[in-house]
Interface confidence: low
């Protein structure tokens, strides 16, 4: 039975050209995390494998940095980076847990946000 929950940074916004940290945390389960995938809609951004470490997708290697922790740092943001991001925890024996973050990249000089947790 899957008992875990994912806590995330929620719905966030940032300014064009800036940087942002995306972070998730899996709790309430003793399952072993074997791999975490970071995806933007249908694109794979990065993988953190328990044995092999980090792999950043070549198309994002100039703008994506691993960490902190199992999180992901997005740099040199563009308006096109607006959208849904998913942290996908592959665990044993539970299976897969997914957390969702919505990022809005704003042109304006003041980036307002209403951060909320998404806990599936």
């Amino acid at each position: 039975m899957m008992t875990g929950t994912i806590e995330t940074t929620g719905n966030i916004s940032a300014e064009k050209g800036g940087s942002i940290i995306l972070q998730c945390h899996l709790s309430s389960t003793t399952a072993q995390v074997t791999q975490v995938n970071w995806e933007q809609q249908d694109q794979l951004l990065a993988i953190c494998n328990a044995d092999l470490g980090w792999h950043i997708s070549p198309s994002f290697k100039d703008r994506v940095a691993p960490g902190p922790g199992l999180g992901l740092t997005l740099q040199s943001l563009t308006v096109n980076d607006t959208g849904e991001y998913f942290c996908i925890y592959h665990t044993y024996p539970d299976g897969t847990y997914t957390g969702r973050i919505f990022l809005e990249v704003l042109e304006s000089s003041v980036a307002e946000h209403g951060a909320r947790f998404q806990i599936p």
């Epitope: 806590e7 940074t9 929620g10 719905n11 966030i12 916004s13 940032a14 800036g18 940087s19 942002i20 940290i21 995306l22 972070q23 945390h25 709790s27 740092t73 980036a111 307002e112 946000h113 209403g114 951060a115 909320r116 947790f117």
Partner: nanobody, 114 residues
Framework: EVQLVESGGGLVQPGGSLRLSCAAS????????MGWFRQAPGKEREWVAS???????WYADSVKGRFTISADNSKNTAYLQMNSLKPEDTAVYYC????????WGQGTLVTVSS
Amino acid sequence: EVQLVESGGGLVQPGGSLRLSCAASGNTFSGGFMGWFRQAPGKEREWVASVLRGGYTWYADSVKGRFTISADNSKNTAYLQMNSLKPEDTAVYYCTTVGYGDYWGQGTLVTVSS
């Protein structure tokens, strides 16, 4: 409008301790994610630690085991307890919501020197 106000900085000797506070006002802490960054003279701003409302924390390797981040949701305040301070910890310390910065405070100066 969101405002973040840091306090608690000052001059301390190597090996000493300080506790920084960051008071948030406005619609900011509802997301429950706060972070501390620092900027040393002539260097880029670097991430130090962050905390989610549920209490989970992350630390930069350079401060792990010496610094502790925490938050009091009821007071909309985040804290950074800094122990075993080193001269290389000298910097202006900033708090922020959500990663590198939807909102930033003005910073508080920490100087570690004998």
